[in-house]
């Protein structure tokens, strides 16, 4: 139950990660204007991975897309194409971890196999979080040193007598979003291989055997011995907690007429 | 086609109170940023107050800061000016103006007349 | 606060003349997001309210003439009216759209000779 718990919500946590980081990666506000020295301009500039935007005060926006491929930083075409690598092997870690799920049955998969496509997903959600934190803390740390080098040259003077204000931009939403997201879909992914060690075959219970005592013939029932091998009678690898417990194909040895004691 | 009609100006003593109405019509009202902008006789034109689509933001001249409050409301296509603590610097024809692309003032209503005098 | 001059203050023509008018801003309008300028033009005519000429320093509002050019980036613009009309004549007036408070010059007198 517990596994099934761990496994589903690592899913969840992962999927809600993954829509976070797609959404992080469309959004426009990655790098906003910095209003520090103008809290009231009335035109306002914000960039994202695709295209910048201007919001001017009579509610006008304007995008423009990044039209060229070769003309753009090599840092913000490395932060693409870590969120692109992010979300795809996302979405394959979800496609995967859907199949691997315990409580849904498809056909006569064994839980050896779910388990190993649990892990298979997990680290996939691991790789895809940390992908897109990278991504994000790349565009931050570039944000950063372009507002310290812009803030050097704040202002340029014409004679002394005109101010050219450099347009300074600082951290977007989407950064926020992305460090949220990436972060989730890491938490997922490590749920999903705690889930993992949870459900490999390696636990499996050996039958009941009755041991007949050369004197006064006692029925032994080890119940909660367990066997480090995948072998054994027991193919339905049910584990059993109590000691007591059998399992539902167990054989059941019935005292015979000289088994009293 | 676009509209903007002023009214409630009018002959205020100093030190009184004003409210202008400005009823537009012919364009979405709530899409568009509204301002207010007054023209002292024989003076060029100067912006009072900004207020956005959404009345997120409200902007005013330092002339009229504390004084004057941009209001409006979508529901009845109107945009509002209270002005209170009237001075006789306030005298003046009030224009209610839609922004345009470039944050320019594209229609300007006919305006109203404030006189501020004892 | 961005000032705006406006210069010269009144102009004498004659029609079908070529009349230019300057503006200068104390801060340069061009905003580097979408390398537009925020300055804008406008012609008032007695009794009636400023009407829109010009946006983006360059940009011509549907309806009006095409003898009206807007040029100038940065702090410098100039407004062209390549061949003067009797209905030209009005007061122009430039306007910073860039940051609030949004400032107009004093403005250009365009009388007939």
């Known amino acids: 139950m517990a596994v099934t718990a761990c496994q589903g919500l690592g899913f969840v946590v992962s999927l809600i990660g993954i829509a976070g980081i797609i959404a992080a990666t469309c959004m426009d506000q990655w790098s906003t204007q910095d209003l520090y020295n103008n809290p009231v301009t009335a035109v306002f500039n914000y960039q994202g991975l695709w295209r910048s935007c201007v919001r001017e005060s009579s509610g006008f926006t304007e995008c423009r897309g990044y039209f060229t491929l070769l003309g753009l930083p090599a840092m913000l075409q490395a932060v693409r194409a870590l969120m692109i690598v992010g979300i795809v092997l996302g979405a394959i870690g979800l496609l995967v971890s859907i199949f691997a799920l315990k409580c849904i049955r498809i056909g006569s998969m064994e839980d050896s196999a779910k388990a190993n496509m649990t892990l298979t997903s997990g680290i996939m959600f691991i790789v895809s979080g940390l992908c897109a934190i990278a991504g994000v803390s790349v565009f931050a740390n570039m944000l950063v040193t372009n507002f310290w080098m812009s803030t050097a040259n704040m202002y340029t003077g014409m004679g002394g007598m005109v101010q050219t204000v450099q347009t300074r931009y600082t951290f977007g939403a989407a950064l926020f979003v992305g460090w949220v997201a990436g972060g989730l879909t890491l938490i997922g992914g490590v749920m999903m291989c705690i889930a993992c060690r949870g459900l490999a075959p390696e636990e499996t219970n050996y039958k009941a055997v009755s041991y007949h005592a050369s004197g006064h013939s006692v029925a032994y029932k080890p119940g909660g011995f367990k066997a480090s091998t995948g072998f054994g009678s027991n193919t339905k690898n049910k584990k059993i907690y109590d000691g007591g417990a059998r399992t539902e194909d167990e054989v059941q040895s019935y005292p015979s007429k000289h088994d009293y004691v | 086609e676009v509209k903007l009609v002023e009214s409630g100006g009018g002959l205020v003593q100093p030190g009184g109170s004003l409210k202008l109405s400005c009823a537009a019509s012919?364009?979405?009202?709530?899409?568009?940023?509204m301002a207010w902008v007054r023209q002292a006789p024989r003076k060029g034109p100067e912006w009072v107050a900004f207020?956005?689509?959404?009345?997120?933001?409200?902007y005013y001249a330092d002339t009229v800061t504390g004084r004057f409050t941009i209001s409006r409301e979508n529901a009845k296509n109107t945009l509002y000016l209270e002005m209170s603590s009237l001075r006789s610097e306030d005298t003046a024809m009030y224009y209610c103006?839609?922004?345009?692309?470039?944050?320019?003032?594209?229609?300007w209503g006919q305006g109203t007349l404030v006189t501020v005098s004892a | 606060d961005i000032v705006m001059t406006q210069s010269p203050s009144s102009l004498t023509v004659t029609a079908g003349e070529k009349v230019t008018m300057s503006c200068k801003s104390s801060q340069s309008l061009l905003n580097s997001g979408n390398q537009k300028n925020y300055l804008t033009w406008y012609q008032q005519k007695p009794g009636q309210p400023p009407k829109l000429l010009i946006y983006?320093?360059?940009t011509r509002e549907s309806g009006v003439p095409d003898r009206f050019t807007g040029s100038g980036s940065g702090t410098d613009f100039t407004l062209t009216i390549s061949s003067v009309q009797a209905e030209d004549l009005a007061v122009y007036y430039c306007?910073?759209?860039?940051?609030?408070?949004?400032?107009f010059g004093a403005g250009t007198k365009l009388e007939l000779k």
């Open positions: 983006w320093a360059s």
């Open positions: 207020i956005s689509n959404s009345a997120y933001s409200i």
């Open positions: 103006a839609r922004l345009g692309y470039g944050n320019s003032f594209a229609y």
């Open positions: 012919g364009f979405g009202f709530s899409d568009y940023g």
């Open positions: 306007q910073n759209d860039y940051s609030l408070p949004f400032t």
